[in-house]
């Protein structure tokens, strides 16, 4: 039987490398059984998680998850660092694994890309193909 | 139940690269990261890098960052290792290994790996 | 890169005596969320490797309890309270908790 408790899925230890300039969605997958959890994005200083107010989130339903998004609309190159989601639930809150966004300047950037960068580039083409209800919190 | 179909042997010559593939069965690589590994006869292991085939976010070990280059296709439920410049240092049987489930990440399954064999 | 030390390099035992390795990090292991990322692999001849014990000692499922992981920071053991015959093959310990990954060189068990 599977847990009705709320989990965040991100991936221990995961990592984007994004463009400064471009859009790019942060996605936290949720899984929840019966009422969807109130989930907030905040971003790492230290030990800290600094919550993210007044940025652009919206939710995507899928058959057996959500995504909570965080939108970057442009990405800058402040929004280099690393973020967590985290869900209040029957009064519990649950914390993702961090994720860490790599964001290489344009202006800066070798006219070669790194091998990461190239590997991630494709992914970018098609996560576009989804469309979202975009909400401001 | 979990599998991992890795492709077959490979026999190359020097100066040429090969690409190793790694089919999964029975979960979604994109919900888990595919690590390769390197195992050079009669010797231990070693960690080539890892993709995370949801975004393409590649992480290597420095010593095989110019010999590897990994990639994936959610599509087909399948990662690859491509290696470049093969001498016989490269002669090795390589394994995909899956990179575990929620919350830890730590490898679990492997493939039943691909023999590499560099000779002129 | 964090340097993975195993002891012994072999280990010849008599079926039904214990057994035991010790795995050694030159970095501590403890990740920032509390846990260490710690595992222990069997390879047999002929075979992938496979894995037995994760998060320093939990047990895979399908491995008997006779072996126990243990250790903590940069000192890790694991056990077999009893050898049997398909405990042969080659030991590993592997560490999951920094870049990059890192495997320690191997304990060949034999038996006696």
């Known amino acids: 039987k599977e847990s009705c408790d709320v989990q965040l899925y991100i991936k221990r230890q995961s990592e984007h490398s994004i463009l400064a300039g471009d859009p790019f969605e942060l996605e936290c997958p949720v899984k929840y059984c019966a009422n969807r959890p109130h989930v907030t994005w905040c971003k790492l200083n230290g030990t800290t998680c600094v919550k993210l107010e007044d940025r652009q989130t919206s939710w995507k339903e899928e058959k057996n998850i959500s995504f909570f998004i965080l939108h970057f609309e442009p990405v800058l190159p402040n929004d280099n660092g690393s973020y967590r989601c985290s869900a209040n639930f029957q009064s519990n809150l649950i914390e993702s694994h961090s994720t860490t966004l790599y964001v290489t300047d344009v202006k800066s950037a070798s006219e070669r890309p790194s091998k990461d960068e190239m590997a991630s580039r494709p992914w970018l083409l098609y996560r576009h193909h989804h469309h979202h209800h975009h909400h401001h919190h | 139940e979990v599998q991992l179909q890795q492709s077959g042997a490979e026999l190359v010559k020097p100066g040429a690269s090969v690409e190793l593939s790694c089919t999964a069965s029975?979960?979604?690589?994109?919900?888990?990261?595919i690590y390769w590994v390197k195992q050079r006869p009669e010797q231990g292991l070693q960690w080539i890098g890892r993709i995370d085939p949801a975004n393409g976010h590649t992480k290597y070990d420095p010593r095989f960052q110019d010999k590897a280059t990994l990639t994936a296709e959610i599509s087909s439920n399948t990662a690859h290792l491509q290696l470049n410049s093969l001498t016989s240092e490269d002669t090795a049987v390589y394994f995909c290994?899956?990179?575990?489930?929620?919350?830890?990440?730590?490898?679990?399954?492997w493939g039943q790996g691909t023999s590499v064999t560099v000779s002129s | 890169a964090v340097v993975m030390t195993q002891t012994p390099l072999t280990l010849s035992v008599t079926i039904g005596q214990p057994a035991s390795i010790s795995c050694k990090s030159s970095q501590n292991l403890l990740d920032s969320d509390g846990k260490t990322y710690l595992i222990w692999l069997l390879q047999r001849p002929g075979q992938s490797p496979m894995r037995l014990i994760y998060l320093v000692s939990k047990l895979d499922s399908g491995v008997p309890d006779r072996f126990t992981g243990s250790g903590s920071g940069t000192d890790f053991t694991l056990k077999i309270s009893r050898v049997e015959a398909e405990d042969l093959g080659i030991y590993y310990c592997?560490?999951?908790?920094?870049?990059?990954?890192?495997f320690g060189g191997g304990t060949k068990l034999e038996i006696k």
């Open positions: 290994v899956r990179g575990g489930d929620h919350p830890y990440y730590v490898m679990d399954w």
């Open positions: 029975g979960f979604n690589i994109k919900d888990t990261y």
């Open positions: 592997w560490q999951g908790t920094h870049f990059p990954r890192t």
